[in-house]
């Protein structure tokens, strides 16, 4: 089962049934390079291996991972610590379907911290697991310098001052 913004999606044999109408968001690249909306069917179709993972209460499960969306606001470093204290980490985005899932669950239009910051030592955007960002996939708008941390808003990733306070997403 997928819980998406309070809507329970049932994935059965690669198809989706959904008790409530849901507006699709997010972009998916298909083979010919054109954009189309990612549908609930797309999200469900990739969930076949999702059945064994158990998530704690108030965490959402998707693609074998668990996600928690904060309601309060903290700086990037405080958000980072908060996730660590709960044996998780700030969100690392792996693919377009995961980003679409995140977008579907972001109810507010404001910035939300993710696990990405600019390290002046490496001079690159780096995920909290230490891996560098793949610039062939990800585009971040805004300053790329010390004290720059990444936040998502709608379908975009922005560079913001790390001391700014936003909501955040934990993942394990």
């Amino acid at each position: 089962l997928l819980v998406s913004q309070g809507v329970l999606l049932k994935c059965q044999k690669g198809s989706c049934s959904n008790a409530t109408q849901y507006e699709d968001t997010g972009d998916l690249k298909v083979n010919n390079g054109t954009r189309r909306n990612i549908s609930n069917k797309d999200l469900c179709a990739s969930r076949s291996a999702d059945q064994t993972v158990l998530c704690q209460s108030e965490w959402l499960k998707y693609q074998g991972k668990c996600y928690w969306f904060s309601n309060e606001m903290k700086s990037w470093s405080d958000s980072y610590v908060y996730c660590l204290e709960r044996k998780s980490h700030l969100l690392i985005i792996h693919d377009q379907l995961e980003m679409a899932f995140i977008q579907k669950n972001l109810r507010q239009l404001n910035y939300v911290w993710i696990g990405l910051n600019f390290t002046s030592l490496k001079m690159t955007w780096t995920w909290v697991d230490g891996s560098p960002i793949d610039s062939k996939i990800f585009f971040i708008k805004g300053p790329a310098k010390e004290n720059s941390c990444a936040a998502i808003k709608e379908s975009k990733i922005f560079s913001e001052t790390c001391s700014s306070v936003f909501k955040w997403i934990c993942q394990y």
């Epitope: 972009d27 690249k29 390079g33 054109t34 954009r35 985005i93 377009q96 980003m99 600019f118 001079m123 690159t124 955007w125 610039s135 062939k136 996939i137 990800f138 585009f139 971040i140 708008k141 805004g142 300053p143 790329a144 310098k145 998502i152 808003k153 379908s155 975009k156 990733i157 922005f158 560079s159």
Partner: antibody, heavy 114, light 113 residues
Framework: SLEESGGRLVTPGTPLTLTCTVS????????MIWVRQAPGEGLEYIGI?????SAYYASWAKGRFTISRTSTTVDLKITSPTTEDTATYFC??????????????WGQGTLVTV | DVVMTQTPSSASEPVGGTVTIKCQAS??????LAWYQQKPGQPPKLLIY???TLESGVSSRFKGSGSGTEFTLTISDLECADAATYYC???????????????FGGGTEVVVK
């Protein structure tokens, strides 16, 4: 300010590098685009140098152009010019402080004739 | 890449008149659209960004509207100095880098009689 340079008369196939020299701001704060305009024609977007040093191109421009940068310059290399590349080449700066891209500072352009 | 289609290619109106220029995107670009004015021998000058936000120092006679795929630039109370070519530009992007392309419309030449 922005100033393009390097435009000249070149023979087809001879690589040419154009330079956009910036002053008064940092390239780690502001993205930069290259745009060209053939004589009597409209504006044509080539690509962008993002604040983190990553370059992205229009589909038609991939392989034909390379964008790179130093601390104060953004270069556009025309890898193998053809007569169709004859144009004035502009660089422009994104204001950087907005969710929208705002290309509000432009150079005067440099003319390339192939 | 998104394709921007601009109409008309030229327009002629008297001083004091109004010109309306339309720009259509081949797919939704939200409100990520800019309008420019260009005069011969000069670089483009930004007029409007975010589809409707007037750039600092630009006359309020210039008005941008629209979102998604349909956009309009309206120039009212035309002055001789408004004679120029006007371009729209998609400034849409997303976290997915291949969406980061900023094409222009074909341009509209405005003649003020």
């Amino acid at each position: 300010s922005l100033e393009e340079s390097g435009g000249r008369l070149v023979t087809p196939g001879t690589p040419l590098t154009l330079t956009c020299t910036v002053s008064g701001f940092s390239l780690s704060n502001n993205g930069m685009i290259w745009v060209r305009q053939a004589p009597g024609e409209g504006l044509e977007y080539i690509g962008i140098m993002n604040t983190d040093g990553s370059a992205y191109y229009a589909s038609w421009a991939k392989g034909r152009f390379t964008i790179s940068r130093t601390s104060t310059t953004v270069d556009l290399k025309i890898t193998s010019p053809t007569t169709e590349d004859t144009a004035t080449y502009f660089c422009a700066r994104d204001a950087g402080s907005n969710e929208h891209f705002v290309f509000n500072l432009w150079g005067q352009g440099t003319l390339v004739t192939v | 890449d998104v394709v921007m289609t601009q109409t008309p290619s030229s327009a002629s109106e008297p001083v004091g008149g109004t010109v309306t220029i339309k720009c259509q995107a081949s797919e939704s670009i939200s409100s990520d659209l800019a309008w420019y004015q260009q005069k011969p021998g000069q670089p483009p000058k930004l007029l409007i960004y975010g589809a409707s936000t007037l750039e600092s120092g630009v006359s309020s006679r210039f008005k941008g509207s629209g979102s998604g795929t349909e956009f309009t630039l309206t120039i009212s109370d035309l002055e001789c100095a408004d004679a120029a070519t006007y371009y729209c530009q998609s400034t849409y992007y997303s976290w997915y880098s291949s969406n980061c392309v900023f094409p222009f419309g074909g341009g509209t030449e405005v003649v003020v009689k």
